[in-house]
């Protein structure tokens, strides 16, 4: 009789996370009598996956009916595979004894787990920035395997080139993470813009995952101010308007000063929105000319989104 061989025909098996892995093993002889055990890894630190003789292995089932006469098939199925299950699995024949002793091992089957990357999460800078400034966006995705992955950045459908990407860890691991930082130059038209991080991986069957960030969360467009004097509405009254244009976000407080003294403060409410997503607002002030002997300096002072105030002044001539 030829000496028993343990045959593991598959050098490697690749399984998607959540599915079952079938690991094949047959022996070529009924001799010697003794159980089969499956291990992950080799050496003293190997992990017992299944023991035909004893133990409870809720995720493992035998593919064939191992109690049946002349059974020489000791293939197993491992359910609900996760990246942590990756490794090399050995089918090992033991010889009956007290205790049973290892007789012969198969060559091993390497199990690799295909795990989908998590949905990319894009985050922008903590503080808003103004047009012409460069801001950084980060994109992170985790838990994927194998390591090969492609990440692209887009702004409004246009691919970006100024970014740096790292996949960690560098060495072998059960799963991997990707981290990318892209630099984006803001323009005044970016209120409606989107930055998109796109991740392509073998597990996604050509349907990449996307994470987005709206530049409306990042950009601050400071207003332009224009103060104009309107024709007299009534005797001794002059209407002065302050046009606040092209600002974003909406949070804005306007203060009128007459010769440096606060006349009125108001918060932007009924604004009009421009096509590019910025806002316009207008405030007016009725000045009683008869109350003034001298010329009046009117100042429209605007505090936008918590930034230092900007102002525009207008000299109101008081004629004798």
């Amino acid at each position: 009789e030829e000496e028993l061989q343990v045959i593991q025909p598959d050098k490697s098996v690749s399984v998607a996370a959540g599915e079952s892995a079938i690991l094949l093993c047959t022996v070529t002889s009924l001799i010697p009598v003794g159980p089969i055990q499956w291990f992950r890894g080799a050496g003293p630190a190997r992990e017992l996956i299944y023991n035909q003789k004893e133990g409870h292995f809720p995720r493992v089932t035998t593919v064939s009916e191992s109690t049946k006469r002349e059974n020489m098939d000791f293939s197993i199925s491992i359910s609900n595979i996760t990246p942590a299950d990756a490794g090399t699995y050995y089918c090992v024949k033991f010889r009956k004894g007290s205790p049973d002793t290892e007789f012969k091992s198969g060559a091993g089957t390497e199990l690799s787990v295909r795990a989908k990357p998590s949905a990319p999460v894009v985050s922008g800078p903590a503080a808003r920035a103004t047009p012409q400034h460069t801001v950084s966006f980060t994109c992170e995705s985790h838990g994927f395997s194998p390591r090969d992955i492609t990440l692209k950045w887009f702004k409004n459908g246009n691919e970006l080139s100024d970014f740096q990407t790292n996949v960690d860890p560098v060495g072998e691991s059960v799963s991997y993470s990707i981290h990318s930082t892209a630099k984006v130059v803001l323009t005044r038209e970016d209120v409606h813009s989107q930055v998109i991080c796109e991740v392509a991986h073998v597990t996604l069957q050509g349907d990449p995952l996307r994470g987005t960030a709206n530049l409306s969360e990042t950009i601050r467009v400071p207003p332009t101010l224009e103060v104009t004097q309107q024709p007299v509405r009534a005797e001794n009254q002059v209407n002065v308007t302050c046009q606040v244009r092209k600002f974003y976000p909406q949070r804005l407080q306007l203060t009128w000063l007459e010769n440096g003294n606060v006349s009125r403060t108001e918060t932007a409410s009924t604004v009009t929105e421009n096509k590019d997503g910025t806002y316009n607002w207008m405030s007016w002030l009725l000045v009683n000319v008869s109350a003034h002997r001298d010329d009046v300096k009117l100042t429209c002072q605007v505090e936008h989104d918590g930034q230092p105030a900007v102002s525009k002044s207008h000299d109101l001539k008081v004629s004798a």
Epitope: K53, E54, S66, T67, E70, K96
Partner: antibody, heavy 119, light 110 residues
Framework: QVQLVQSGAEVKKPGASVKVSCKAS????????INWVRQAPGQGLEWIAM????????HYNQIFKDRATLTTDTSTSTAYMELRSLRSDDTAVYYC????????????WGRGTLVTVSS | DIVLTQSPDSLAVSLGERATINCRAS??????????IFWYQQKPGQPPKLLIY???NRDSGVPDRFSGSGSGTDFTLTISSLQAEDVAVYYC????????FGQGTKLEIK
């Protein structure tokens, strides 16, 4: 280590039934066949039947097919052999034995249960 | 059914001498490349103990003075050098079909 612990001796009257138990430990009960063998006083070994606890598949010696019933309780890892319509020549030591290689052999044995049938 | 016949029924051998027990099957017990014959030793008041499986393979812990041989219908259990603790009844069993035992051979010291 594998252990098969059998129930205690029984004395039965002719025509009665007996149910012998065999509690297994030291291995996964559902992974190996259990055989039942008897030995009358001063006589040889006589195979009665075998059962696969994983699915209750059974094989019986034709001599015992109508009188013996093998069952298992996987929750307690216990095998049972019931013999009905007892006769005086059923007086014997009844053994359970585990088949470790699925070869229809008997690798590990219980210590036996003496069943005495007497009026 | 396959019937196993052992010979002799009893045997007396001197300590250190060779003991040979035969088992003949009424038809071949060879199948799938294996001879489905097993040998057991039973000492008084004890259950049987498996010695040899598939005709020629010693079970774990069995001293190497015990050996099994044969093929097809004729099989032999040999004890190369009889020891006092080998006094027992020896049984052959087949499992080519459902198991049956031979009638047993009583081995004693001469």
């Amino acid at each position: 280590q594998v252990q098969l612990v059998q129930s205690g001796a029984e004395v039965k009257k002719p025509g009665a039934s007996v149910k012998v138990s065999c509690k297994a430990s030291g291995y996964t009960f559902t992974n190996y066949w259990i055989n039942w063998v008897r030995q009358a006083p001063g006589q040889g070994l006589e195979w009665i039947a075998m059962i696969d606890p994983s699915d209750s598949e059974t094989h019986y010696n034709q001599i015992f097919k109508d009188r013996a019933t093998l069952t298992t309780d996987t929750s307690t890892s216990t095998a049972y052999m019931e013999l009905r319509s007892l006769r005086s020549d059923d007086t014997a030591v009844y053994y359970c034995a585990m088949d470790y290689g699925s070869l229809y052999a008997m690798d590990y044995w219980g210590r036996g249960t003496l069943v005495t049938v007497s009026s | 059914d396959i019937v196993l016949t052992q010979s002799p029924d009893s045997l007396a051998v001197s300590l250190g001498e060779r003991a040979t027990i035969n088992c003949r099957a009424s038809q071949s017990v060879r199948s799938s490349g294996y001879n489905w014959i097993f040998w057991y030793q039973q000492k008084p008041g004890q259950p049987p103990k498996l010695l040899i499986y598939l005709a020629s393979n010693r079970d774990s812990g069995v001293p190497d003075r015990f050996s099994g041989s044969g093929s097809g219908t004729d099989f032999t259990l040999t004890i190369s050098s009889l020891q006092a603790e080998d006094v027992a009844v020896y049984y052959c069993q087949h499992s080519r079909e459902l198991p049956t035992f031979g009638q047993g051979t009583k081995l004693e010291i001469k």
